[in-house]
Amino acid sequence: QQQTLPKPFIWAEPHFMVPKEKQVTICCQGNYGAVEYQLHFEGSLFAVDRPKPPERINKVQFYIPDMNSRMAGQYSCIYRVGELWSEPSNLLDLVVTEMYDTPTLSVHPGPEVISGEKVTFYCRLDTATSMFLLLKEGRSSHVQRGYGKVQAEFPLGPVTTAHRGTYRCFGSYNNHAWSFPSEPVKLLVTGDIENTSLAPEDPTFPADTWGTYLLTTETGLQKDHALWDHTAQNLLR
């Protein structure tokens, strides 16, 4: 006899990285017929929603109109059908960005390198932080974490054309409070003609704002949140 229902999916729209004072919606997707959804923040009950009619709704949304450092942290959700509760969802790390300062990102030896070259990114921020994060724009939200007093090094190793793309870095004041993003660095890796033509590449984005990137990770996968790559989320833990 089943004692619990399957865990729901949890995600943030437009993204789990939210600029301060901007809005974000936490989504929780359970099953049709769920009469109650609970959102927990840092282990305590944060909000409740009772969908109507429950048999036609399998997803609820919890809206945060004004992101700040107090709202940043770990969220999870559960739902119930009748008296039976679900397993808790995976943890969603909601991060507030655009805090305090802007780091500078540089790449060694440079932004246009030959295939096989060893490439290292350097993220520098002179204010009080010791953790840095390097993100490659794209659907899978590649994230690396680095440490240092004023800078961190992110060695990519010998690069291939698959490393092409746009990178940014953040200083992290704690796991859930990040700096403004650095200016982007676009890495171009040139190889043999055959290699280049076959190279996998993350989707490219309009060069307007960082917000464009913030919209990509989950919205590209909204039809099936089971596919959502938790690389960045897991890294925070």
């Epitope: 060694h108 030896p109 440079g110 096989g116 070259e117």
Partner: antibody, heavy 120, light 107 residues
Framework: QVQLQQPGAELVKPGASVKLSCKAS????????MHWVKQRPGQGLEWIGM????????NYNEKFKSKATLTVDKSSSTAYMQLSSLTSEDSAVYYC?????????????WGQGTTLTVSS | DIKMTQSPSSMYASLGERVTITCKAS??????LSWFQQKPGKSPKTLIY???RLVDGVPSRFSGSGSGQDYSLTISSLEYEDVGMYYC?????????FGGGTKLEIK
């Protein structure tokens, strides 16, 4: 054309500090890593470290971490290396070199070197 | 740190002779190796990078080869202007490290 200009010589006393300069011209200073290399009289070359002029990011040879401090002044396109607590072991020729920004280990341009003499 | 052992430390060769200088790394450096030439009183000049790639403007008599820990610089036919010091540099790992140098003179 690309030039890295360094003063020909510096004479300093033991225990003092010195700030060696490398003025770049003929290219976008902030786009290339600048390296510093030491050569003692009649001896080989030693890599001290490198700095990115745009970000100020650095990478030092551990051996020189407490000896050398690399900085830049973007407004004058000048890279600096400060050497502290000087001893006779620091007497050497110091070169700045611009690395190609598409391949490591390819030092495209070198300064003519500054001969540092530490003597009382 | 990776140690680069260069040999010979000095050598004499005749004009037109084929000259080979070797560099051995204390570990595999994955062909991340450059060769430099330095003439007396002058700054070094890069000849080869990535073990075998010739820098633009460097005469084709210079060539580089090797992999793993063992690398060599060859001058196919020695010319008078080739006299000077030659250094290898590994840049597989920080800190970059140079070989001890080879002094090449005309016999």
């Amino acid at each position: 054309q690309v030039q890295l200009q360094q003063p020909g010589a510096e004479l300093v006393k033991p225990g003092a500090s010195v700030k060696l300069s490398c003025k770049a011209s003929g290219y976008i200073f902030t786009s290339y890593w600048m390296h510093w290399v030491k050569q003692r009289p009649g001896q080989g070359l030693e890599w001290i470290g490198m700095i990115h002029p745009n970000s100020g990011s650095t990478n030092y040879n551990e051996k020189f971490k407490s000896k050398a401090t690399l900085t830049v002044d973007k407004s004058s396109s000048t890279a600096y290396m400060q050497l502290s607590s000087l001893t006779s072991e620091d007497s050497a020729v110091y070169y700045c070199a611009r690395e190609g920004n598409w391949a490591r280990g390819y030092f495209e341009y070198w300064g003519q070197g500054t001969t540092l003499t530490v003597s009382s | 740190d990776i140690k680069m052992t260069q040999s010979p430390s000095s050598m004499y060769a005749s004009l037109g002779e084929r000259v080979t200088i070797t560099c051995k790394a204390s570990q595999d450096i994955n062909s991340y190796l450059s060769w430099f030439q330095q003439k007396p009183g002058k700054s070094p000049k890069t000849l080869i990078y990535r073990a075998n790639r010739l820098v633009d403007g460097v005469p084709s008599r210079f060539s580089g080869s090797g992999s793993g820990q063992d690398y060599s610089l060859t001058i196919s036919s020695l010319e008078y202007e080739d006299v000077g010091m030659y250094y290898c540099l590994q840049y597989d790992e920080f800190p970059y490290t140079f070989g001890g140098g080879t002094k090449l003179e005309i016999k």
